[in-house]
């Protein structure tokens, strides 16, 4: 059967006026997954995102990530979109550095 991913969105300071937002999906099976950043609901182009490889995490499941750099103050426009085994979800950027969003999807 399939195991839905845990999705975790974090943010970190990149440079003055910019932040890097990273969306991590972990503990999912099978390995096929769509993970992409969207702005106003529209997927960012590939050249503005960085993807990690889909790697085994040692538990028979997989993990991956996608990151992009955005302007501070525009966080509300961005969501991480995840699609896995016919299920999908969108995940907002947390409002502060200490905030992480963890969601398990079934």
């Amino acid at each position: 059967g399939s195991v839905p991913p845990m999705v975790n969105v974090t943010r970190s300071e990149a440079s003055e006026g910019n932040i890097t937002v990273t969306c991590r999906a972990s503990s999912f099976y099978p390995r096929n997954i769509t993970l992409t950043w969207r702005q106003d609901g529209v997927s960012l182009s590939h050249d503005t995102q960085q993807w990690g490889d889909v790697l085994p995490d040692g538990n028979g499941t997989y993990q991956t990530w996608v990151a992009t750099r955005i302007c501070q103050g525009e966080e509300q426009r961005f969501t991480c979109y995840m699609e896995h085994s016919g299920n999908h979800s969108t995940h907002p950027v947390p409002s502060g550095n200490s905030h992480h969003h963890h969601h398990h999807h079934h």
Epitope: G41, V42, L44, S45, T79, S89
Partner: antibody, heavy 118, light 108 residues
């Protein structure tokens, strides 16, 4: 086939409110944003706002923020636009549209004409 | 707010002629965020070109787009009767999302 079907034309008096619906089909409703755009007679297109039905996030054009409410009912795959304190200059065709993979508006509803007249 | 100015307001041409429509932005826009739509009377707009130069599904190859920064162009290489319509550019780079005022391509 992706379809966005809007409610019928409305005639309202100044000061009243109107609620326009947009029923989506042919795709997973919560996977795309729904935008609202209006077009006054003989004029151009004006973006009102959008909703992400999955997380319920709404972004408004500041120009409309005080009088507009955008909502969505995921159980019926329907988005709504409510405009209050109507005035004659709100007479327009109101469109709903879906956020595309690569563009902001890839599928459109047929439009709903709202006429504000005393 | 990014203001998009389209020119000319009206373009009078004959079938078979080449149409060149311009869209000028008040601030620089990434080419990823500039799109074109076609609208015929009594109909909703239809996505024509996305991200400056990519044809939307089902759009014939006589349509093309180009540009960068603040200046973008939609070209129709040889006008067909069904191409006479109003064309709008739109930017998705910054809020509020904005459209140009439109260029009407009419039969001469």
């Amino acid at each position: 086939e992706v379809q966005l079907v809007q409610s019928g034309a409305e005639v309202k008096k100044p000061g009243a409110s109107v609620k326009v619906s947009c029923k989506a089909s042919g795709y997973a409703f919560t996977s795309n944003n729904i935008y609202w755009v209006r077009q006054a007679p003989g004029q151009g297109l004006e973006w009102i706002g959008y909703i992400d039905p999955y997380i319920g996030r709404i972004i408004y054009n500041q120009q409309f923020k005080d009088r507009v409410t955008i909502t969505a009912d995921t159980s019926t795959s329907t988005a709504y636009l409510e405009l209050s304190s109507l005035r004659s200059e709100d007479t327009a065709v109101y469109y709903c549209s879906r956020s595309g993979e690569r563009s902001n508006f890839d599928y459109w509803g047929q439009g709903t004409l709202v006429t504000v007249s005393s | 707010e990014i203001v998009l100015t389209q020119s000319p307001a009206t373009l009078s041409l004959s079938p078979g002629e080449r149409a060149t429509l311009s869209c000028s932005a008040s601030s620089s826009i990434s080419s990823n965020y500039l799109h074109w739509y076609q609208q015929k009377p009594g109909q909703a707009p239809r996505l024509l070109i996305y991200r400056t130069s990519n044809l939307a599904s089902g759009i014939p190859a006589r349509f093309s787009g180009s540009g960068s920064g603040t200046d973008f162009t939609l070209t129709i290489s040889s006008l067909e009767p069904e191409d006479f319509a109003v064309y709008y550019c739109q930017q998705g780079g910054s809020l509020p999302l904005t459209f140009g005022q439109g260029t009407k391509v009419e039969i001469k």
